[in-house]
């Protein structure tokens, strides 16, 4: 279990740390003001008590100030994501100060040692902020700390220790090991800034969770459930690098949080929206696509400040690469009767036809089971903007795809050899767009034909009432 009491080992050892030797030139924590998008450009180094670099490097006291905080490192050098983030911030916020917090000497350690250094690094950042606050026109409210992995908790400590309250902290997949279940002051928490937003992309409920599972901000966003990220499977990784390993998969999923944030900066015309939901399963069912009462928000840089009494867990689906935006739809299918369903769940697919484009054939994921004489809700999402929906094709897949289903079908046949054909009756499908919040009802093309069976399809067209809004507000992008 972790060494009690923090950065330099045990609490009681704190007052007896050896002083830095004379030969030690480089401080353990450096503040690099990035004056150019070019990663090769050295920028300027800021240090507490030295005002000259602020003037020499045109530090803008009235502008936004971003502090980018890296995490644990195995290589001891800056990774590519950091340069991309610096560049994206410069592109989006031309006048802003972008400061890279370089704590590589303290992060390039055993993970447990790096964890035990987070408090001291957070304290260094707080001291820098306290010093900057002494300058005219500098406001903590304009400070945005962006921390990746272990860096997210460093940002938490900085926000905790600073005299006053920083404007915003963004946690990009905050580290999990040694922080899961930790005390509120020992990890990133909503108390650390006026607004704390978090992206979770590598959480696992089994095995080691590299990212923290529990919510630690005002809003905690779990793209794709916060675990398996599209484009990060072993196959994808093997295809894109010479020697794909499980390490690359971990890096891909963990780092996805950074790329989602970068995407929100550079593709502000294609914002991704997340929807409040109690858990991933309910979201997968399509239950949570509401924007009422602040239940949806843009993700990343464009997130609207929300300070709920209780933490808000939010979910969304994404594409495998930039731009990550997808279009979410809730599909409510009322099954009013079915015949001879047997043991196995049907496999349904839908194809959506719109004024702009048609979707691919999309599977309807059955999270639990199809309920009879009930409304069954599903989530589907498309990578392209279909425009206004015109019609839907619902297909019941014929032959079983899995050996398990085939076996169940065979067993079902043995017990009821003269089992007549399975059949389901559906009159209408109600669709709600997550992105526009518009609702539409689709009716079967032929009102007399509402049944569907394996290997068959059913077509639905817009019912007469057309699109309607139901006191729902659509998600709006509030550009900072």
């Amino acid at each position: 279990s972790p060494v009690p009491f923090g950065p330099e080992g045990r609490l009681e050892d704190k007052l007896h740390k050896p002083k830095a030797t004379q030969t030690e030139v480089k401080p353990s924590v450096r503040f690099n003001l990035r004056t150019s998008k070019d990663p090769e450009h050295e920028g300027c180094y800021l240090s507490v008590g030295h005002s000259q670099p602020l003037e020499d490097c045109s530090f803008n006291m009235t502008a936004k100030t971003f502090f980018i905080i890296h995490g644990w490192t195995m290589s001891g050098i800056f990774e590519n994501w950091l340069h991309k983030l610096v560049s994206a911030l410069h592109t989006r916020e031309k006048d802003a100060n972008v400061v890279v917090v370089d704590w590589l000497p303290l992060a390039h350690q055993l993970y447990t040692d790096a964890v035990n250094n987070t408090r001291v690094v957070g304290h260094s950042i707080a001291r820098m902020l306290d010093w900057l606050q002494e300058k005219d026109d500098f406001s903590l409210g304009n400070v945005h700390l962006i921390g990746y992995s272990l860096g997210a908790h460093v940002a938490g400590y900085a926000g905790n220790f600073v005299k006053g309250t920083v404007g915003r902290i963004t946690g990009l997949d905050p580290a999990g090991p040694m922080f899961e279940g930790a005390d509120i002051h020992k990890r990133l928490s909503p108390d650390d800034a006026d607004f704390v937003d978090v992206l979770h992309t590598y959480t696992r409920s089994f095995g080691l969770s590299i990212g923290i599972q529990m919510p630690v901000g005002h809003i905690d966003i779990y793209p794709n459930g916060g675990d398996f990220q599209p484009g990060c499977g072993l196959n994808d990784v093997l295809g894109s690098i010479a020697y794909g390993t499980i390490t690359e998969v971990v890096k891909c999923e963990h780092e996805r949080a950074v790329h989602l944030f970068v995407d929100s900066l550079v593709n502000q015309d294609k914002p991704s929206f997340a929807f409040q939901c109690t858990d991933s399963n309910r979201f997968k069912k399509g239950i949570c696509l509401s924007c009422r009462k602040n239940r949806c928000n843009s993700i990343g840089y464009n997130a609207k400040k929300m300070r709920n009494k209780r933490n808000s867990k939010m979910y969304l689906k994404t594409r495998a690469g930039m731009p990550f935006r997808v279009y979410h739809y809730q599909m409510k299918i009322h099954v009013f009767s079915y015949k001879n369903m047997g043991e196995i769940e049907p496999t349904f697919y839908v194809t959506l036809y719109g004024t702009n484009a048609d979707s691919q054939t999309l599977p309807l994921e059955i999270v639990e089971r199809i309920e009879q004489n009930a409304t069954n809700t599903f989530l589907v999402y498309t990578e392209e903007d279909l425009g206004d929906l015109l019609k839907i094709q619902l297909t019941w897949e014929g032959a079983s795809q899995s050996w398990y289903n085939l076996w169940k079908e065979f067993r079902s046949y043995l017990s009821q050899p003269r089992n007549p054909g399975r059949e389901l009756n559906i009159r209408r499908i109600r669709v709600k767009s997550g992105e526009t919040q518009r609702k539409l009802t689709f009716c079967t093309e032929d009102p007399e034909n509402t049944s569907i069976s394996p290997g068959r399809e059913l077509w639905f067209r817009k019912c007469r009432d057309g699109w309607r809004m139901k006191n729902e507000t659509s998600p709006t992008v509030e550009l900072p």
Partner: antibody, heavy 116, light 107 residues
Framework: QVQLVQSGAEVKKPGASVKVSCKAS????????IAWVRQAPGQGLEWMGE????????KYNKKFKGRVTMTRDTSTSTVYMELSSLRSEDTAVYYC?????????WGQGTTVTVSS | DIQMTQSPSSLSASVGDRVTITCKAS??????VAWYQQKPGKSPKLLIY???YRFTGVPSRFSGSGAGTDFTLTISSLQPEDFATYYC?????????FGGGTKVEIK
């Protein structure tokens, strides 16, 4: 080693105020939150609030909001808890505790008796 | 505020017994729960933090488990020095809240 040493017992009249001190040693005083927890006779533990000595940030239990004030003196590594408008139900043992993994280390407690 | 409900409020056990104390949170606190031991006239002592991690110097007979809203403190083989009152506390959010306590007495 880490030590939290509290001031001695107090007897106060209803309506008065009490100020209890907690002197810390053996660790970096400014960077760990110190909480105040009280325990009425025969009762459980009740969190009153906490202070971060470095920045003097405080968090209070709203039950005591307006009656409790937590301060610190970094030169002597001491935190103070003042409770005003005392009533008989404030009779309790008051503990200070330093937080890291949990309330890792506690003071010995200060008995405050409120009686007319 | 998050309420922490402990049960039982008291129990009688013998040396060598396995003792289990439970704590229920009114809302999800994930694994942000600590357990304390308090002997009469003494200050509380931290036993377990983050639901299942033993604090420095705590004997291995003490173990914690649970996540979400349900938590358990187990003493695998009760020793004479373990007769005390035990408290759970959530440290997920402010205000920090304690359970009502469980007094472990000699049978």
């Amino acid at each position: 080693q880490v030590q939290l040493v509290q001031s001695g017992a107090e007897v106060k009249k209803p309506g008065a105020s009490v100020k209890v001190s907690c002197k810390a040693s053996g660790y970096t005083f400014t960077t760990y939150w110190i909480a105040w927890v009280r325990q009425a006779p025969g009762q459980g533990l009740e969190w009153m609030g906490e202070i971060l000595p470095g920045s003097a940030k405080t968090k209070y239990n709203k039950k005591f909001k307006g009656r409790v004030t937590m301060t610190r003196d970094t030169s002597t590594s001491t935190v103070y808890m003042e409770l005003s408008s005392l009533r008989s139900e404030d009779t309790a043992v008051y503990y200070c505790a330093v937080y890291d993994y949990g309330a890792d280390y506690w003071g010995q407690g200060t008995t405050v008796t409120v009686s007319s | 505020d998050i309420q922490m409900t402990q049960s039982p409020s008291s129990l009688s056990a013998s040396v060598g017994d396995r003792v289990t104390i439970t704590c229920k949170a009114s809302q999800d606190v994930y694994t942000a729960v600590a357990w304390y031991q308090q002997k009469p006239g003494k200050s509380p002592k931290l036993l377990i933090y983050s639901a299942s991690y033993r604090f420095t110097g705590v004997p291995s007979r003490f173990s914690g488990s649970g996540a979400g809203t349900d938590f358990t403190l187990t003493i695998s083989s009760l020793q004479p020095e373990d007769f005390a009152t035990y408290y759970c506390q959530q440290h997920y959010s402010i205000p920090r809240t304690f359970g009502g306590g469980t007094k472990v007495e000699i049978k």
